[in-house]
């Protein structure tokens, strides 16, 4: 019989008492085969973290700073359940740490040196740890003691709870630095008042502070937020302009064998029976013998943290950077305007080979990081392990939802001004063999399908979006008799036609021979009835242009396109017979790397781009023998985006809407995780 006990860790007598009450009340409402609670008492949160890691306890609820500690080796814990605040309809699981300034003050984030600062309190998250952690490498050396470095960075501050004797500058704006509401500039409202009164130039608070203190929009409009990219935004745009997004209070468990499903089952049932306004006898979010025992008193319920989300992703790049800077205190030798090498994310060993070749030719400008799937690469870029990669539009959408930004677009047509003119896009098509003359768009049911990969534009999002509109369900594996759609569940009929061996079967990378445009076309040639690819795929792989044994004798005339009106046309008539226009592939990165990725890639394409004529004796960035490694092989240049510099603007309203509609069919664990952070 599986053990269905969750051992909750308590850190005080009062918590232990509430835990026992929790245990007893759960027993009274949950059947004997359901989850149960046991209580383990430890002296501190850090002891609880160690106990969970050692399998002496299973769960504890932690503030963000402790979630970071819990994630560090050797603890390796992960977030499994989040408390939420506000309403069930609009649950808030995160708050945003922001830097608020007066509208007319005219400086940016990188110009804070010498300004006057207002903090909620020394050592507090939004008011101190996050802003000071992010500014850490700009502080004057020596950076220890930290208070002295901060005092020397700003021209005056109010940092309640600081030592006014040792660091008088930190108390210059609020004499005494009192550590309670007796100090008018203490806490969130106090720090904002410090700004409002004109004592300080910037207040480090949370996003809700300004709304709680200024009910009137006209008053709020006198203030702005400083963004990390050295711009400003209105105060209601905090989701796009903050220092960090911070989880409020989170249940953590072991990463391996951590009982996360059981913990969720327990807490979900607990909130049903003992959540807000549920029971008089026992209340989960109430602490008669103290404050915030086991859970925050202000919590309204729990949400399950998506399983794909580890602590780094949950806490977010900015928060992890800030806390790591504060804890480890390491900075580059001297801050320079030089760009660090761009860490390119390569998919599987084929891309890694090409990336290694690029790296040595780039003389240190490019470094390589490997991952097995596109989603793993996106996650690595999010958390700073990698910096950039070029993505199909479907993944630009996921990357955008995960906070990444497009920085350059692949262009496929030769033009005089290639780098300055991003193209409208390419065509997604459905290709069939000419010999299968009865096949049309309207009778694909039961046929064998070939897809570039799940989640990609021409191979999946466009054809499956159109199909979904017709069949109104997501069971595409039942619509087609079998197929190859790399990235599908291994037991799905949409992996049946794939050719990868062993563990590589149906993998969404080049180890699966039917992956990508060329792979999907090969699947059609060898096994399938229809391939969903781009309009250039057939000409690029016929007429001897692809020398691989399977392709060298193919003739373009032996293939036709399916049109949406039920007719068929020759391959060259793609402009009048396609499924939709697809946005070109684009390079994505984190916002903080945008300028450097742009600069280095433009240098790299000038060295190794289409201007290189002999690719047998020189490195060519946009060539890989029809395998589309790192970039599409038909890329002519990487083009500036001008104002299309967000994923929505880049992909266009129509495509974003189409992918949004298909979201209900999504199997992307990363998309689920990212929409948890930003619904």
């Amino acid at each position: 019989v599986p053990d269905k006990t969750v051992r909750w860790c308590a850190v005080s007598e009062h918590e232990a008492t509430k835990c026992q009450s929790f245990r007893d009340h759960m027993k009274s409402v949950i059947p004997s085969d359901g989850p149960s609670v046991a209580c383990v008492k430890k002296a501190s949160y850090l002891d609880c973290i160690r106990a969970i890691a050692a399998n002496e306890a299973d769960a504890v609820t932690l503030d963000a700073g402790l979630v970071y500690d819990a994630y560090l080796a050797p603890n390796n814990l992960k977030p499994v359940v989040a408390e939420f605040y506000g309403s069930k309809e609009d649950p808030q699981t995160f708050y945003y740490a922001v830097a608020v300034v007066k509208k007319d003050s005219g400086f940016q984030m990188n110009q804070l040196r010498g300004k006057k600062s207002c903090h909620t309190g020394l050592g507090r998250s939004a008011g101190w740890n996050i802003p000071i952690g992010l500014l850490y490498c700009d502080l004057p050396e020596p950076r220890k003691p930290l208070e002295k470095a901060v005092a020397n960075f700003f021209s005056g501050s109010c940092a309640p709870c600081a030592d006014g004797t040792d660091f008088p500058q930190l108390c210059q704006l609020c004499p005494g630095c009192g550590c309670s509401t007796l100090n008018q500039y203490f806490g969130y409202s106090g720090a904002f008042k410090c700004l409002k009164d004109g004592a300080g130039d910037v207040a480090f608070v949370k996003h809700s502070t300004i709304f709680e203190n200024l009910a009137n929009k006209a008053d709020r409009d006198q203030y702005e937020l400083l963004c990390l990219d050295n711009t400003r935004k209105p105060v209601d745009e905090y989701k796009d302009c903050h220092l960090a997004q911070v989880p409020s209070h989170t249940v953590v468990a072991r990463s391996m064998g951590g009982k996360e499903d059981l913990i969720w089952e327990l807490l979900n049932q607990a909130q049903e029976h003992f959540g807000k306004d549920k029971s008089k006898e026992f209340q989960l979010f109430s602490s008669p013998h103290g404050k915030d025992l086991l859970f925050k008193d202000s919590a309204h319920g729990f949400l399950k943290v998506p399983p794909r989300m580890d602590a780094k992703m949950y806490l977010g790049y900015e928060y992890v950077t800030a806390i790591r800077n504060l804890r480890e205190g390491t900075c580059p030798e001297a801050p320079t305007d030089e760009c660090k090498p761009v860490k390119w994310c390569a998919l599987s060993h084929h891309e890694r080979l090409k990336c290694d070749e690029w790296s040595v030719n780039s003389v240190g400008k490019i470094e390589c990081v490997s991952a097995e799937t596109t989603e793993d690469c996106i996650a690595k870029i999010m958390n700073g392990e990698a910096d950039a990669m070029s993505l199909d539009g479907g993944f630009v959408y996921i990357a955008g939802k995960c906070g990444l930004v497009p920085v350059l677009a692949e262009n496929y047509n030769k033009s005089d001004n290639c780098e300055d003119t991003p193209e409208a896009g390419y065509f997604a098509i459905a290709v069939v063999k000419k010999s299968a003359s009865d096949l049309t768009w309207d009778n694909l049911k039961g046929k064998k399908s070939c897809h570039t990969a799940v989640g990609r534009t021409a191979g999946w999002n466009i054809p499956m979006g159109l199909l979904y509109n017709k069949i109104n369900h997501c069971r595409f594996d039942e619509f087609f008799s079998e197929g190859c759609a790399p990235g599908s569940k291994k037991d799905s009929s949409l992996c049946k036609l794939c050719m990868g061996s062993g563990l590589n079967l149906c993998e969404p990378n080049n180890k699966e021979g039917y992956y990508g445009y060329t792979g999907a076309f090969r699947c059609l040639v060898e096994k399938g009835d229809v391939a969903f690819v781009k309009h250039q795929t057939v000409p690029q792989n016929t007429g001897g242009k692809n020398p691989d044994p399977w392709a060298k004798n193919l003739n373009e005339k032996d293939y036709e396109l399916l049109c949406l009106d039920g007719t068929r046309k020759p391959v060259e008539e793609y402009a009048n017979c396609h499924l939709a226009r697809a946005p070109n592939h684009a390079v994505v990165t984190r916002k903080d790397k945008e300028a450097c990725v742009h600069k280095i890639l433009r240098q790299q394409q000038h060295l190794f781009g289409s201007n290189v004529t002999d690719c047998s004796g020189n490195f060519c960035l946009f060539r890989s023998e029809t395998k589309d490694l790192l970039f599409r092989d038909d890329t002519v240049c990487l083009a500036k985006l001008h104002d299309r510099n967000t994923y929505e603007k880049y992909l266009g309203e129509e495509y974003v809407k189409a992918v949004g509609n298909l979201r209900k069919c999504s199997t992307s664990s990363l998309l689920e995780a990212c929409t948890f952070r930003r619904p």
Epitope: L353, V363, G617
Partner: nanobody, 117 residues
Framework: QVQLVESGGGLVQPGGSLRLSCAAS????????MGWYRQRPGKQRELVAA???????NYADSVKGRFSISRDNAKNTMYLQMNSLKPEDTAVYYC???????????WGQGTQVTVSS
């Protein structure tokens, strides 16, 4: 397309040295980039070092300061000088000229290096 043959591997004690050679069947003068990879038991093949025609080099962090890559275009040979060898350097070492056959996983036999006392 030139064929490449690796040699020079063997059994060596920790702290010892070896020099691997990669001989090409034709001219390597026109080959821009060449590299050494290794595959440890149960692991993916990984870059050890690479060198361009112009002499730019790149090393894996784990071998920096201990290994040195060079090429002699006149002798159509590339070398990997391996010093201060460690047990974790035990692997089959392969050379590559980054031509299209490597995208087809068409690697040579490699040369076995074993570091053990």
């Amino acid at each position: 397309q030139v064929q490449l043959v690796e040699s020079g591997g063997g059994l060596v004690q920790p702290g010892g040295s070896l020099r691997l050679s990669c001989a090409a069947s034709g001219s390597i003068f026109s080959i821009n980039t060449m590299g050494w990879y290794r595959q440890r038991p149960g692991k993916q093949r990984e870059l050890v070092a690479a060198i361009t025609r112009g002499g730019n080099t790149n090393y894996a962090d784990s071998v920096k300061g201990r290994f040195s890559i060079s090429r002699d275009n006149a002798k159509n040979t590339m070398y990997l000088q391996m010093n201060s060898l460690k047990p974790e350097d035990t692997a089959v070492y392969y050379c590559t000229d980054y031509s299209r056959r490597y995208y087809q996983d068409d690697w040579g036999q490699g040369t076995q290096v074993t570091v053990s006392s």
